[in-house]
Amino acid sequence: QLPPGKPEIFKCRSPNKETFTCWWRPGTDGGLPTNYSLTYHREGETLMHECPDYITGGPNSCHFGKQYTSMWRTYVMMVNATNQMGSSFSDELYVDVTYIVQPDPPLELTVEVKQPEDRKPYLWMKWSPPTLIDLKTGWFTLLYEIRLKPEKAAEWETHFAGQQTEFKILSLHPGQKYLVQVRCKPDHGYWSAWSPATFIQIPSDFIMNDHHHHHH
């Protein structure tokens, strides 16, 4: 029977800068029941606080609700593991909420084949930012990426859309059914998951463009 091994805070994420959750990985348990607590202070403070919510994020997690989350203050946190034989502490972790944002996927992806009379046909898609993200404040810049592939293909074709919420693709294989997805990333944070796939049937008379490129 031994004191517990050193835990590690291995992930912190926020969906929108208004709340966030951190998760830790326990070290060895020393063969005894082990209690874990996460303590933190904010920059400029010496007063230590205990995790406000060990439940919401699931096992080995600490959730900071709206009233505990500040974008303007860095959090300095550590996890303490304790059993009857002693204690161990994780490394201190510095958390700036701006740098842990991982949004939900974009919404309402719609895809259409456009066949203008005077120009080559193209695939047109548009989407909306995730609802939790408030882009009007200017705190957020969301970047978007699209991927698509014929239904039976193994490889995805990826296009970076920048900050736009619509996109055109000119080069597609006629007669194929395509899967299309979109994801987003804040300028300092993490890519969202891909949106659910949208399917689009490319008509057999779709004229393949000479150049494999896209227009914004």
């Epitope: 860095t74 510095y94 958390v95 701006t98 740098y99 990333k185 993490y190 890519w191």
Partner: antibody, heavy 118, light 112 residues
Framework: EVQLVQSGAEVKKPGSSVKVSCKAS????????MHWVRQAPGQGLEWMGV????????NYNQKFKGRVTITADESTSTAYMELSSLRSEDTAVYYC???????????WGQGTLVTVSS | DVVMTQTPLSLSVTPGQPASISCRSS???????????LHWYLQKPGQSPQLLIY???NRFSGVPDRFSGSGSGTDFTLKISRVEAEDVGVYYC?????????FGGGTKVEIK
């Protein structure tokens, strides 16, 4: 204990490429972004770029105009910085550096001296 | 790119005496999120840099309280209240508000 251990010193010819490695231990490699910073002899520090090892997203200092490529190998917890079209002014100590969930550098590698000379 | 200008270039200080280093940025360093990402690093002889102060005035873990940072906008200062022999090295200010992140040219502190 977090450690960043870099590969050894290199001597390269102008026009060639160099690839410096940075092996991370003591933490979950994919959890934190890895940066590269260089320091020419007797000079200050210069940020080159960063990688998110969890999905290989990169952001580079435009000064290096496509000459720098940062990669990460999750299976070995190792980050790499490759610099091509080397010139004498690329002679420098190259550091890998890790932040926490922040935008400053909490941990640094020991540095790798790259000498470019004909 | 944001240019960071440090003064003085070098500083020779008697142990126990104070020291002050100035750092001026060519652009304001207030991020769109309201934070000012101005940091100070110390590179001791033969070593990698180490973080001293983050976000203008916050001492990093384990940094003695004789080190303090202040400033706002484009003008920032690092003060050492009583210099000790172990404080010798080159001090760098750094901004990470704007990409690319940039560093000052460094201030070399030596003991008289």
């Amino acid at each position: 204990e977090v450690q960043l251990v870099q590969s050894g010193a290199e001597v390269k010819k102008p026009g060639s490429s160099v690839k410096v490695s940075c092996k991370a231990s003591g933490y979950t490699f994919t959890s934190f972004w890895m940066h590269w910073v260089r320091q020419a002899p007797g000079q200050g520090l210069e940020w080159m770029g960063v990688i998110d090892p969890s999905d290989t997203y990169t952001n580079y200092n435009q000064k290096f105009k496509g000459r720098v490529t940062i990669t990460a190998d999750e299976s070995t917890s190792t980050a790499y910085m490759e610099l091509s079209s080397l010139r004498s002014e690329d002679t420098a100590v190259y550091y890998c550096a890790r932040g926490d969930y922040s935008n400053w550098f909490t941990y640094w590698g020991q540095g790798t001296l790259v000498t470019v000379s004909s | 790119d944001v240019v960071m200008t440090q003064t003085p270039l070098s500083l020779s200080v008697t142990p126990g005496q104070p020291a002050s280093i100035s750092c001026r940025s060519s652009q304001r360093l207030v991020h769109s999120n309201g934070n000012t990402y101005l940091h100070w690093y110390l590179q001791k002889p033969g070593q990698s840099p180490q973080l001293l102060i983050y976000k203008v005035s916050n001492r990093f873990s384990g940094v003695p309280d004789r080190f303090s940072g202040s400033g706002s906008g484009t003008d920032f200062t690092l003060k050492i209240s009583r210099v000790e022999a172990e404080d010798v090295g080159v001090y760098y200010c750094s901004q990470s508000t704007h990409v690319p992140w940039t560093f000052g040219g460094g201030t070399k502190v030596e003991i008289k």
